[in-house]
Amino acid sequence: TPEVWVQVQMEATELSSFTVHCGFLGPGSISLVTVSWGGPDGAGGTKLAVLHPELGTRQWAPARQARWETQSSISLALEDSGASSPFANTTFCCKFASFPEGSWESCGSLPPSSDPGLSAPPTPVPILRAD
């Protein structure tokens, strides 16, 4: 069964800078990746980025840079809002559309007691949806 993993990482050099890493574990080719926060895409979440393997990437504030890390994983850097701990306790969701499997989505957040530079390990998928 395909699986999606999500890691949220606070950068050691900039305490106000966060990076979301997402990956797809499974066969098939990825046609689109959507990253949202505050909930799943289309279910109360706000879109942060869309990444297409050929047509490029699209990002919305406060996303700073969305990019492919491998053919099946992406990263999204977020800029500080000026608020204290701006992205703590915030849920980030990644949705991978792949062929022929369909769409798979998982969500994660920064662990409550994260040290700078550490990230959440790839956890069991809390939200897993095949469309």
């Epitope: 505050g38 490029g56 919305w60 608020a83």
Partner: antibody
Framework: EVQLQQSGAELAKPGASVKLSCTVS????????IHWVKQRPEQGLEWIGG????????VSASKFQDKATITADTSSSTAYMQLSSLTSGDTAVYYC????????????????WGQGTSVTVSS | DIVLTQSPASLAVSLGQRATISCRAS??????????MHWYQQKPGQPPKLLIY???NLESGVPARFSGSGSGTDFTLNIHPVEEEDAATYYC?????????FGGGTKLEIK
Amino acid sequence: EVQLQQSGAELAKPGASVKLSCTVSGFNIKDTYIHWVKQRPEQGLEWIGGIDPAIGNTVSASKFQDKATITADTSSSTAYMQLSSLTSGDTAVYYCARERVHSNTLYYAMDYWGQGTSVTVSS
Amino acid sequence: DIVLTQSPASLAVSLGQRATISCRASKSVSISGYSYMHWYQQKPGQPPKLLIYLASNLESGVPARFSGSGSGTDFTLNIHPVEEEDAATYYCQHSRELPPTFGGGTKLEIK
């Protein structure tokens, strides 16, 4: 200079369809979303939907999903919206608008608007 | 859908005074310090014009007498000092989730 030029006024009969156009200049249509907004006479604004011309993704409000079809032709820098099965409730001014973009980041707000296309549905 | 309620529906303000327009959302439109609320001005026969984006950011070319504030569910647009050319209808719009919705509008008259 950023501009969105919309097609002219339409007079249509109930049950008919119309296709509105929005031709952009002063920026690359692939760099941002183009949205469509409805404004009935003396009333407020309603978001219909939008399109990402680079990727071809469309998003729309559920109440307009069977009413409006949004497309784009990047070669002519034009976005289109087709309204089908017209009724008197579709009589309105329809605006296209560009989503605000800066340094490759979008902001979910609409910073440049077309002049509007008036659609009148009458038998 | 998130409902935006603007108040007052209309107001009359003397030249040079402050105009305050409120917008209340039926649920929070903020996440971690980011507020997905925007303000527009519309004059008769013209399309809307973006004034403020993300609650408090002044759009390029908009006079500094316009300012936005708020977070969560309560937002405010302030105009001070009000000028004759500010007579218009003002709309708030959220983009916290799909579909984005607009407030009902506030008509500002200059006395």
